[in-house]
Amino acid sequence: SCNTATCVTHRLAGLLSRSGGVVKDNFVPTNVGSEAF
């Protein structure tokens, strides 16, 4: 499965939006990489 910050952030954003949650602007998962590389 996708192992980058962007992938995981998008997945979490989708889950949270469906559950009424909010993703903080500065949220970055701590156990994945970065698409910016």
Epitope: T4, T6, C7, T30, S34, E35, F37
Partner: antibody, heavy 122, light 107 residues
């Protein structure tokens, strides 16, 4: 002006150690994730290691070829990145670049230094 | 690890021509592919990220496309300064990996 300046390269014997440094300026270093990428003479690019920002626990990842021999670290107060290289081998001979990057979500930043040459030879 | 295979190894074209460079991944990487340009004695420069997003200051003649396992970098009309080596990379999984490079040379 954004700058990443590597230093610490040189000639070292097989089995020896070397510590590379990367001095950053012109951007908020502490927010950036940093990797070392190397390029053997006349060859392609190879990712070596990554360290995340302090807010991301300064977590690290390594390529299999260097795991257990190389250690990446950072000092945000000094805007500096380090690569401690132990048990060096001939195949570690390369130009080593530090790369800083940051994902804003809608855009990114990606900065490379000019590299420092490491030669492992007897 | 994910292996990236670039083709052709060398591409010989003239200024003004269109260049098409290919990058194929051994496993699906969605759109997590970047393209870098490197000239002799210089550090690589990011051109494209996320498969199709031009990086800051990169001319519009550079474009990227693809998803899954097949990716393409297109230079619509070659300028003299475009002759260099081009690398694709993936950031979908660790370890980050690069293709072996395509050398774009003047015909």
């Amino acid at each position: 002006e954004v700058q990443l300046v590597e230093s610490g390269g040189g000639l070292v014997q097989p089995g020896g150690s070397l510590r590379l440094s990367c001095a950053a300026s012109g951007f908020t270093f502490s927010n950036y994730w940093i990797s070392w990428v190397r390029q053997a003479p006349g060859k392609g690019l190879e990712w070596v290691a990554e360290i995340r920002s302090e807010s991301d626990a300064s977590a690290t990842h390594y390529a299999e070829a260097v795991k257990g021999r190389f250690t990446i670290s950072r000092d945000n107060a000094k805007n500096s990145l380090y690569l401690q290289m132990n048990s060096l081998r001939a195949e570690d001979t390369a130009v080593y670049y530090c790369v800083g990057y940051f994902d804003y979500g809608l855009a990114i930043q990606n900065y490379w230094g000019q590299g420092t040459l490491v030669t492992v030879s007897s | 690890e994910i292996v990236l295979t670039q083709s052709p190894a060398t591409l010989s074209l003239s200024p003004g021509e269109r260049a098409t460079l290919s990058c194929k991944a051994s496993k699906r990487v969605t759109t997590y592919v970047s393209w870098y340009q490197q000239k002799p004695g210089q550090a690589p420069r990011l051109l494209i990220y996320g498969a199709s997003n031009r990086y800051l200051g990169i001319p519009a003649r550079f474009s990227g496309s693809g998803s899954g396992t097949d990716f393409t970098l297109t230079i619509s009309s070659l300028e003299p300064e475009d002759f260099a080596v081009y690398y694709c990379s993936q950031s979908y999984n660790y370890p980050y990996t690069f293709g072996q490079g395509t050398k774009l040379e003047i015909k």
